[in-house]
């Protein structure tokens, strides 16, 4: 049986093994086509979601479609209601909370009150003045806060009361992948883990742990990735694993927070990593622990020189690092976080690329998050 | 629309208190702030303060701190100015009004006389 | 404080002229935290315009109010009979909020 299933697929009426290798190869084998179904699917960037939630306060702001202008909500007459809908309309399934903010006197937005219109939230006409002088601050999900705060110090090994959110992601029960934990349904991680085997069968995720071997894993329900393009395979390194049962969240077991989609990160803003990758580059072995290090963010006009990733570096992707190198993610931390802390975690970018591991002048790559808000958006609604 | 019914005409002595309400209906208390500005006879207007009733803290203009508190009670949905140690100077109309930055619906006024 | 200055201190205007009332802040505030309000004799002050230029609701089109930094207009393109009060600008922005000394528009 455990050799059937590791070599071969059961297609049914009639009932007849193929070779597991057909799978997901584009050729319907199956009569039924289901050798074809469970794999990694794309999943288009979609159109505008127009809500959206600022890094002042977590703030909500509500789009026009009429106009293309942003404007942010008031208080006044907000309810939960709204509230639910606004995080519906960004995917989410469970319970907000929000609370009133006083407008900042650097308010750059116009300010308008906002009402309910076929499940989307609108500016209601002719709304007057805020009269609450607050805007709505809105929490889709709680997320972010650890059990424990990490130093600051060069690399050491992690434990999971820090980075709750962190997952192994493995095929034939081989670590490939790190992940994070985003909602009890879904992980987000690097495209590029699922680009030689892209039947979502095999893999799994494993979450509540720092030890690779030690935890249960979890079934994949779907992969869902971007357009793949071939001409640069570097671009989109996004994906989104929606687990077949929700996960129950502990001390040990949470979720990261998505970045604002205004969080721009200055050079040198510190920044951590984590992962079980490859200790050295070209050899070394996987690391059975976690391990974390501290970063920063690296300009990216820096990380484009000539001395260094010469323009492949895209404003979809971002670099960080440490100066003098020495201290980068490497094979096997793929998919995993790189993230900021501010009142909470905050995943900023995806475990991607790099030439060598640690170099000076070539630090890690990273899929930029805030860049791809719309489209992680667009498929939880799509999936809601 | 937000309507503000204010208390009546007070007369009050130098070094005493005054506590004038402002008490709204339609709309929801809770979500707007109330301000306070008053105008003294034959004078412009001036910032006293405001509260938002869903936070509870008040603010306050610098020149009234520590003789004015503005309160809000959300059940019969009425907002509070008290002023004290008053002096000839505070001779006014007391006014509330909905809003924060930009003042909506304003209450009828209440004229506060002191006088020995 | 920032200080609201407005000028004329009164304007005598004929009806269905142009009125045109200034207020100049001492330092610059955002445009989205300007007011102006019309007060008559014995009543409480009405809001006309807020965010500098965005007319409240109820307020006919004749009044309209521009400008940024520190220097703000209000216009009201032909005077009625019932447009004859006090004018006071209002700034939002920095706290304390501050009210201008007023503009009366008087009949000429």
């Known amino acids: 049986k455990v050799i059937l299933d590791k070599y071969y697929f059961l297609c049914g009426q009639p009932l007849h093994f193929i070779p597991r290798k057909q799978l997901c190869d584009g050729e319907l084998d199956c009569p039924l086509g289901e050798d074809e179904e469970h794999c990694v699917k794309s999943f288009p960037e979609g159109p505008a979601v127009a809500v959206r939630l600022s890094k002042d306060r977590s703030t909500l702001q509500v789009l026009d479609s009429a106009t293309g202008n942003w404007f942010s909500a008031c208080f006044d007459n907000f309810t939960e209601a709204l509230a639910e809908t606004a995080c519906r309309q960004m995917g989410y399934s469970s319970k907000p909370t929000f609370r009133a903010v006083e407008i900042g006197p650097d308010q750059d937005l116009d300010v308008v009150e906002i009402t309910e219109n076929s499940q989307e939230l609108r500016m209601r006409n002719s709304s007057g003045p805020c009269l609450s002088g607050s805007l709505v601050s809105l929490h889709c999900l709680a997320c972010g806060k650890s059990l424990k705060t990490p130093r600051v110090v060069g690399v050491e090994e992690a434990s999971v009361d820090s980075w709750p959110w962190q997952v192994s992601i493995q095929y034939d029960k081989q670590h490939v992948c790190g992940g994070s934990i985003l909602d009890p349904h879904w992980v987000l991680t690097a495209a590029h883990c699922f680009r030689k085997h892209t039947d979502v069968f095999n893999w799994k995720v494993r979450a509540g742990s720092d030890k690779l071997g030690s935890f249960p894993s979890l079934a994949v329900a779907k992969i869902i990735i971007i357009e793949f393009n071939p001409m640069y395979p570097k671009d989109n390194d996004i994906a989104l694993m929606k687990l077949q049962f929700p996960l129950t969240f502990s001390g040990t077991v949470r979720p990261i927070c998505l970045p604002f989609f205004d969080e721009e990160l200055t050079p040198a803003t510190p920044l951590w990593i984590i992962g079980w990758g490859f200790t050295k580059q070209n050899g070394g072995k996987m690391s059975d622990i976690l391990l974390q290090a501290s970063v920063q963010v690296i300009d990216s006009t820096r990380c484009n020189a000539d001395d260094a990733y010469q323009g492949e570096v895209t404003e979809k992707m971002m670099c960080a690092g440490i100066p003098e190198g020495g201290v980068d993610t490497c094979q096997g931390d793929s998919g995993g976080p790189l993230m900021y802390q501010s009142d909470q975690w905050h995943v900023v970018g995806i475990v991607s690329w790099g030439y060598g591991c640690g170099g000076p002048s070539t630090p890690g790559v990273y899929t930029k998050v805030s860049a791809y808000l719309n489209w992680i958006y667009n498929v939880w609604k799509a999936e809601l | 629309q937000v309507q503000l019914v204010q208390s009546g005409a007070e007369v009050k002595k130098p070094g005493s208190s005054v506590k004038v309400s402002c008490k709204a209906s339609?709309?929801?208390?809770?979500?707007?702030?109330i301000s306070w500005v008053r105008q003294a006879p034959g004078q412009g207007l001036e910032w006293v303060g405001g509260i938002m009733p869903i936070f509870g803290t008040a603010n306050y203009a610098q020149k009234f701190q520590g003789r004015v508190t503005i309160t809000a009670d959300e059940s019969p949905s009425t907002a509070y100015m008290e002023l004290s140690s008053l002096r000839s100077e505070d001779t006014a109309v007391y006014y509330c009004a909905t809003g924060r930055r930009e003042l909506l619906n304003w209450g009828q006024g209440t004229l506060v006389t002191v006088s020995s | 404080e920032i200080v609201m200055t407005q000028s004329p201190a009164t304007l005598s205007v004929s009806p269905g002229e142009r009125a045109t009332l200034s207020c100049r802040a001492s330092?610059?505030?955002?445009?989205?935290?300007l007011a102006w309000y019309q007060q008559k004799p014995g009543q409480a002050p009405r809001l006309l315009i807020y965010g500098a230029s965005t007319r409240a609701t109820g307020i006919p089109a004749r009044f309209s109010g521009s400008g940024s930094g520190t220097e703000f207009t209000l216009t009201i393109s032909s005077l009625q009979s019932e447009d004859f009060a006090v004018y006071y600008c209002m700034q939002g922005t920095h706290w304390p909020y501050t009210f201008g000394q007023g503009t009366k528009v008087e009949i000429k």
């Open positions: 330092q610059s505030v955002n445009s989205r935290f």
């Open positions: 339609g709309g929801t208390f809770s979500s707007y702030a």
